[in-house]
């Protein structure tokens, strides 16, 4: 009956962790004698190819300084301990502790048997490192030039993480990769870039990080922060201001980052009706008179700059009873 070596084609281990490379001689054959079990790295330099051996009488030896006896052990193989005990070498599973990048590669498990000869199996050990992810908004001020408004960083992954962005904005990503502080790892940084405007402020974009060590992609929401001057509009005009009306109000509506620091109401004519009283963002009109036939201007300032809006007012002689007119400016 032929014997064969059962190994896994590929084994993945975490950097710094412990991994087992399974190796079994199958099936159990009566009278089959295993004279030596060896683990080798066929692709390593000649003096580092022989990694571990298990002798039926003398037990394990670890002939290569890399990985070395401190980091290697046979999981179940047992040597003969005297007259009555047979060596148990059918399971030659090898454990590697404190995995390093240099441990990655092909490993051959070989059984020297009598009378069947040598049989072997090969396993590819992949060393992976789970990256640590973070994403953050960059505080930016509006401009005409594309600017990085968010960063997504996947630190010390092996292989490098894949970063993408989910957003409805008009953007592009710029990626850089640098070696991590842990040898063999890579830190990936993706810069979410757009022309910063008020439209982007407060918008949440999502950084998506994919890595084979993750069961599912990591999704990290980032709320953008764009400093921009006030964007102003005026509401409250209903196209039905008539002489003597007393319940009229104009509101200066603002979107800005940071918050407005001041509101200023004026008219384009330069004359300001005395019955109009500015109260911050509101202009309260006590009684409409003919001086209101003008254009009101609301000017808003914040730390970045200023914005303004105009509202043309038409004063009627009598109320318009035909129906409510359009509001806003």
């Amino acid at each position: 009956q032929d014997v064969r070596v059962q190994v896994l084609p590929e084994v993945r281990g975490q950097l710094g962790g412990t991994v087992e490379l399974p190796c079994h001689l199958l099936p159990p054959v009566p009278g089959l004698y295993i004279s030596l079990v060896t683990w080798q790295r066929p692709d390593a330099p000649a003096n580092h190819q022989n990694v571990a051996a298990f002798h039926p009488k003398m037990g394990p030896s670890f002939p290569s300084p890399k990985p070395g006896s401190e980091r290697l052990s046979f999981v179940s193989a047992k040597q003969s301990t005297g007259q009555d005990t047979e060596a148990e070498l059918q399971d030659a599973t090898l454990a590697l502790h404190g995995l390093t990048v240099e441990d990655e590669g092909n490993y051959t498990c070989e059984f020297a048997t009598f009378p069947k000869g040598s049989v072997r199996g090969m396993t590819w050990l992949r060393v992976i490192a789970k990256p640590k992810n973070q994403a953050e908004a960059q505080k930016v001020t509006f401009s005409q030039d594309p600017t990085t408004v968010a960063l997504c960083i996947s630190k010390e992954g092996r292989p490098p993480a894949r970063i993408s962005w989910l957003s409805s904005l008009d953007w592009e990503a710029k990626e850089t990769q640098v070696s991590g502080t842990l040898a063999g790892t890579v830190t990936v940084t993706s810069r979410f870039t757009l022309v910063p405007s008020g439209r982007a402020d407060g918008v949440t974009v999502t950084c998506k990080v994919e890595h084979e060590s993750f069961e599912e992609p990591a999704l990290i929401p980032v709320t953008l922060s764009v400093r921009y001057p006030p964007e102003v509009s005026i509401s409250g005009y209903d196209d039905n201001w008539y002489l003597g009306r007393t319940d009229a109000t104009l509101s200066c509506d603002v979107r800005s980052n940071p918050e407005p620091t001041g509101y200023d109401w004026s008219t384009t004519s330069g004359t300001f009706p005395t019955s109009a009283v500015a109260q911050g963002s509101q202009l309260v009109i006590h009684a409409v008179d003919s001086l209101f036939n003008t254009t009101f201007v609301c000017t808003v300032t914040n730390a970045v700059g200023m914005g303004r809006a105009e509202q043309v007012i038409f004063v009627r002689e009598t109320p318009n009873t035909a129906g409510a007119g359009a509001t806003g400016g």
Epitope: L36, A53, H55, K57, M58, F114
Partner: antibody, heavy 115, light 111 residues
Framework: QEQLKESGGRLVTPGTPLTLTCTAS????????MSWVRQAPGKGLEWIGV??????STYYASWAKGRFTISKTSTTVDLKITSPTTEDTATYFC??????????WGPGTLVTVSS | SFVLTQPASVQVNLGQMVSLTCTAD??????ASWYQQKPGQAPVLLIY???SRPSGVPDRFSGSTSGNTATLTISGAQAGDEADYYC?????????????FGGGTQLTVTG
């Protein structure tokens, strides 16, 4: 540079115990099975015994049992000749076992047993 | 006990191929190794695990086994190959263990 060097060989009178020491450099002795081999003048190689990498097992040639003791520390392997006879006159080599072969040898140390 | 038999001496002409044999008195369950030893020097491992060659050993040295016999072949012998050659194997039979050397073959390169 991986090296082995034997020491302690000298002229002794029959029956006087003698300990030879093999010192390793450039590698860790605890990772390897280590053997002692001797060669009488003009004769062939003769295996004396082995100590396992862990130090937990020692095996001797049938003719050497009781006449020799092998022990090890983290950097040395010792061979004690308990009661030398004139037939023990030889060059004594320590050797490192790797995958079924002795791939590193010391230059040898000469032991002469004479009255 | 386990015995390995080698011819005491073999001659070969310079540049010729030569095969050195090593016969076990009982069928070995283990690998054969071959060593070269020059006068006044320590042995050097040439072949281990029947056919494997350590790094640094010229590829004109090769090993093979068939039944009870292990063979070291030197293809294109050189003057520097003149030396004693020892075969060896480990005897794992029973509860004990020993490593056994053959008696050695003295190789002379002529011409």
């Amino acid at each position: 540079q991986e090296q082995l060097k034997e020491s302690g060989g000298r002229l002794v009178t029959p029956g006087t115990p003698l300990t030879l020491t093999c010192t390793a450099s450039g590698f860790t002795i605890s990772s390897y099975h280590m053997s002692w081999v001797r060669q009488a003048p003009g004769k062939g190689l003769e295996w004396i015994g082995v100590i396992s990498a862990s130090g937990g097992s020692t095996y001797y040639a049938s003719w050497a049992k009781g006449r020799f003791t092998i022990s090890k520390t983290s950097t040395t392997v010792d061979l004690k000749i308990t009661s030398p006879t004139t037939e023990d006159t030889a060059t004594y080599f320590c050797a490192r076992e790797s995958y079924g072969g002795y791939n590193l040898w010391g230059p040898g140390t000469l032991v002469t047993v004479s009255s | 006990s386990f015995v390995l038999t080698q011819p005491a001496s073999v001659q070969v002409n310079l540049g010729q191929m030569v095969s050195l044999t090593c016969t076990a008195d009982t069928l070995s369950r283990s690998y054969a190794s071959w060593y070269q030893q020059k006068p006044g020097q320590a042995p050097v491992l040439l072949i281990y695990r029947d056919t494997s060659r350590p790094s640094g050993v010229p590829d004109r040295f090769s090993g093979s086994t068939s039944g009870n016999t292990a063979t070291l072949t030197i293809s294109g012998a050189q003057a520097g190959d003149e030396a004693d050659y020892y075969c060896a194997t480990d005897d794992n039979s029973g509860s004990s263990y020993q490593y056994v050397f053959g008696g050695g073959t003295q190789l002379t390169v002529t011409g």
